[in-house]
């Protein structure tokens, strides 16, 4: 089918466009181009007869058109009026007509835009600024750039007037930036020169430097003032309210005690009309003062608060030193010194951080020490401990229980028996107890400063007779040659004898067996697999003798060096190879095989049917015990001979 392609489709004024013809039929008589979407003699641009190769201009010919033998039409020096449709009329040799229409659009080349502003010196937090992109151009798109980035999303930025106007509401000093606008149409894009927004601001509260406020007599005082401001601020200095000079720096050489006082810096912005002042109190000492420590928190709470200790006074050109517990500062991530060493910060204080702390000021001759400061760290209460630890008492004795919980300030204590409040004391005393005094004894510790409470509950049984004992262990699965195990015979009772048996026999003499805690605890050091036996404890008092159920120690061990069976290493071709690996281990190990270093299967038995000399090589069995984290292996060389070549060889399994 006959089609027209416009190259380009969007054409800039003054440029050219080619109306390219596709699928032009053969055996043509001629063709004609028309302006518009139909064949209209009044709007013919040019005609062409193939036989004569003659081009004939039509009424719409402008002299800028060139027709090519392939029927394509070139239009040069494009003007706005050229926009629109163009129709090609083709007359074939059989005088049958064919038509096709194409089109293009003409756009002007855009000029370089510029930015106009409604306020050249807006005041921070007060004024708005509207930037407008000039000129206003039809069919153009407007874009804005801030510091060569696209516009940030902000409620203070608003685009209007078809994006031609950018308004900044309530300008801030951070709006001081390079602003550009860009105009775009299908044939061109132009960017303006940048406009720098000059936001007037300040002055902010001035800062006086250096920060130190303590000086020695004879030193020079050199104070500098700075306040953020646009335009830059004008500065004035006042000493004790009296004007001194209109400079940014104040210099007084060889100061004396009389130069002590309040020093005021005033910053003034002539454009915004604003003034701000800052006052610093300068103290001039006749000679170095004795230092002292100030703290930002006199009662810090453990694990919650940080404490900043500052060595006063602040003196220029001075070395500050610190001591904790009469030692130089330990290295600790919780201890931080400021750059000038004047402030020591304890992050997340603990009860061990009480001190004492001392700071020192080093001068030419000596170090002046502050008085020591002790931190009052509030902590606790920790879980209270009830002593003694006995849970069984015989009738008729006095029950005297003491409760203690680490706490600052010291805890307040309460006792409850079976949930009923008894007394608000640290010690509970009951004389001549009977079985009716059996029950749950609760000690409650309360810290009035933190408001925290902690309780411990102890079951007390009053009985002449002891119960059947039981064994508790601190390690249910010890690892051979590594762990120790402590067995404890429960309960703990007064006037009680504790005894131990292993496999029904009294304890063997061994440096690895140790009795402690009144024979109530039996410790096995460096356990071995041979310690996996039945342990029984017995308790005896005035009226009872009783044994616990046995506890069997489950010692984890191995894997030992594995053994591969059968031991044969020579096989005849065609035999079956059936290797079994075994390693002493608890729990049972995991097995895996490698042949010539290549992993095989994860089984205890390796089976290969009808082996050949190709099966020669090294057969390695690997064992691993996940519980002990240990591994072991063994390697065996296997030789396979061709049948009948080597008498006396094993036939295999």
């Amino acid at each position: 089918k006959l089609t027209i392609e416009s190259t380009p489709f969007n054409v800039a004024e003054g440029k050219e466009v080619l109306l390219l013809v596709h699928n032009l039929p053969q055996h043509l008589f001629g063709y004609s181009w028309y302006k518009g979407e139909r064949v209209d003699g009044n709007r013919q641009i040019i005609g062409y007869v193939i036989g004569t190769q003659q081009a004939t201009p039509g009424p719409a010919y402008s002299g800028r058109e060139i027709i090519y033998p392939n029927a394509s039409l070139l239009i040069q020096n494009i003007i706005q009026n050229d926009t629109g449709f163009y129709t090609l009329h083709v007359i074939k040799s059989d005088l049958v007509n064919e038509e096709a229409t194409g089109q293009f659009r003409v756009y002007p080349e855009l000029p370089k835009p510029s930015i106009s502003s409604n306020n050249s010196k807006p005041v921070e937090d007060k004024d708005a600024v509207a930037f407008t992109c000039e000129p206003e151009t039809q069919d153009a798109t407007y874009l804005w750039w801030v510091n060569n980035q696209s516009l940030p999303v902000s409620p203070r930025l608003q685009l209007s007037n078809g994006n031609r106007t950018l308004t900044l509401f309530n300008v801030t000093r951070n709006d001081t930036a390079s602003y550009k606008c860009e105009t775009q149409n299908p044939v061109s894009a132009r960017r303006s020169d940048s406009v720098i927004l000059n936001v007037l601001y300040g002055p902010d509260a001035p800062t006086i430097s250096p920060l130190n406020t303590s000086y020695r007599s004879g030193e020079n005082l050199n104070l500098s003032c700075h306040a953020a401001s646009n335009p830059p601020a004008q500065y004035s200095w006042f000493v004790n309210g009296t004007f001194q000079q209109s400079t940014q720096e104040l210099f007084i050489p060889n100061i004396t005690v009389n130069n002590s006082g309040s020093y005021t810096c005033q910053a003034h912005n002539s454009d915004t009309g604003l003034n701000r002042t800052t006052v610093t109190t300068i103290t001039v000492y006749a000679e170095p003062p004795k230092p002292f420590i100030t703290s930002n928190n006199s009662n810090p709470v453990e694990d919650e608060d940080a404490v900043a200790l500052t060595c006063e006074p602040e003196i220029q050109n001075t070395t500050y030193l610190w001591w904790v517990n009469n030692q130089s500062l330990p290295v600790s991530p919780r201890l931080q010194l400021s750059n000038d060493n004047r402030t020591l910060t304890l992050l997340s204080v603990t009860r061990n951080d009480v001190g004492p702390y001392e700071c020192g000021i080093q001068n030419e001759l000596s170090v002046d020490h502050s008085d020591p400061v002790i931190l009052n760290v509030l902590y606790g209460p920790d879980d209270p401990t009830i002593s003694p630890s006995y849970t069984y008492y015989r009738p008729g004795v006095n029950l005297s229980l003491s409760c203690h919980a680490a706490s600052n300030p010291p805890a307040q204590y309460s006792w409850l028996i079976d949930g009923n409040i008894q007394q608000h004391t640290q010690e509970l005393f009951i004389s001549n107890i009977t079985e009716k005094n059996s029950g749950l004894y609760t000690c409650q510790a309360n810290n009035s400063a933190s408001g925290h409470s902690r309780t411990t509950v102890k079951t007390i049984t009053v009985s002449a007779e002891l119960p059947k004992p039981s064994i508790s262990s601190n390690n249910s699965k010890p690892v051979e040659d590594k762990d120790a195990v402590a067995f404890t015979c429960e309960p703990e009772a007064q006037n009680t004898t504790y005894l131990w048996w292993v496999n029904g026999q009294s304890l063997p003499v061994s440096p690895r067996l140790q009795l402690s805690n009144g024979n109530r605890t039996l410790t096995l050091f460096n356990v071995t697999r041979n310690d996996a036996r039945a342990y029984v404890c017995g308790i005896q008092n005035s009226v009872s003798a009783n044994r616990s159920d046995p506890v069997t120690l489950d010692v984890l061990y191995g894997p030992d060096t594995p053994i591969i069976s059968p031991p044969d290493s020579s096989y005849l071709s065609g035999a079956n190879l059936n290797l079994s690996c075994h390693s002493a281990s608890n729990p049972s190990p995991q097995y895996s095989w490698r042949i010539n270093g290549i992993p095989q299967q994860h089984t205890q038995v390796l089976f290969i049917a009808k082996i050949t000399p190709n099966n020669n090589g090294t057969y390695a069995c690997f064992v691993s015990n996940l519980a002990t984290g240990r591994n072991n292996s063994i390697v065996k060389s296997i030789t396979v001979s061709a049948s009948g070549t080597s008498p006396g060889l094993s036939a295999g399994a």
Partner: antibody, heavy 120, light 106 residues
Framework: EVQLQQSGPGLVRPSQTLSLTCTAS????????MHWVRQPPGRCLEWIGW????????EYAPKFRGRVTMLADTSKNQFSLRLSSVTAADTAVYYC?????????????WGQGTLVTVSS | DIQMTQSPSSLSASVGDRVTITCSAS?????MHWYQQKPGKAPKLWIY???NLASGVPSRFSGSGSGTDYTFTISSLQPEDIATYYC?????????FGCGTKLEIK
């Protein structure tokens, strides 16, 4: 072999003091609590008390407190019972008794018993 | 004091019979212990801590119970079992005994 051998008079005058001794063999009394029990003729068993020979601690039944004293002599591996101001009601067979671990087993050992008659 | 009430006070049974003796304590006790005494002999510990047989005691003997009520059982009475049996509590002082159950053969 563990044994408790009792000795002491079989006849005591009213208002006098009954005194019995129990000598132990086969174990060390210092490691155990030693009891005394009595059985009046045709009546129930009555526990009198115990002594801890290691430190001399004692525990007496309230019925006998004030009249009874138990003592131990660990060097001789023996202990004794003294009951003062006896009456006919104190006529009984008196036993010494110990509960100990003999090897792996908890064992109960008794003396042969001494019949004490209170009579004038 | 904890009173121990043993019943029956005497019992006549045939060889092979199942025999049950009960002991009731006036207050709850941790365990009950049972003694066998033959005429002219010292008592022997027979069952300790409610249900454990003392060394050498035949398995036809058993004990059970908790709190205040305990039972002593002979599953099949034998001639050598003829004796007086006493219960004892050791939970609180003074230690107290029941007054015994005298066992006879019919």
């Amino acid at each position: 072999e563990v044994q408790l051998q009792q000795s002491g008079p079989g006849l005591v005058r009213p208002s006098q003091t009954l005194s019995l001794t129990c000598t132990a063999s086969g174990f060390n009394i210092k490691d155990n609590y030693m009891h005394w029990v009595r059985q009046p003729p045709g009546r129930c068993l009555e526990w009198i008390g115990w002594i801890d020979p290691e430190n001399g601690d004692t525990e007496y039944a309230p019925k006998f407190r004030g009249r009874v004293t138990m003592l131990a002599d660990t060097s001789k591996n023996q202990f004794s019972l003294r009951l003062s101001s006896v009456t006919a009601a104190d006529t009984a067979v008196y036993y010494c008794h110990v509960l100990i671990y003999a090897g792996y087993l908890a064992m109960d050992y008794w003396g042969q018993g001494t019949l004490v008659t209170v009579s004038s | 004091d904890i009173q121990m009430t043993q019943s029956p006070s005497s019992l006549s049974a045939s060889v092979g019979d199942r025999v049950t003796i009960t002991c009731s304590a006036s207050s709850s006790v941790t365990y009950m212990h049972w003694y066998q005494q033959k005429p002219g002999k010292a008592p022997k510990l027979w069952i300790y801590s409610t249900s454990n047989l003392a060394s050498g005691v035949p398995s036809r003997f058993s004990g059970s119970g908790s709190g205040t009520d305990y039972t002593f059982t002979i599953s099949s009475l034998q001639p050598e079992d003829i004796a007086t049996y006493y219960c004892q509590q050791r939970s609180t002082y003074p230690l107290t005994f029941g007054c015994g159950t005298k066992l006879e053969i019919k």
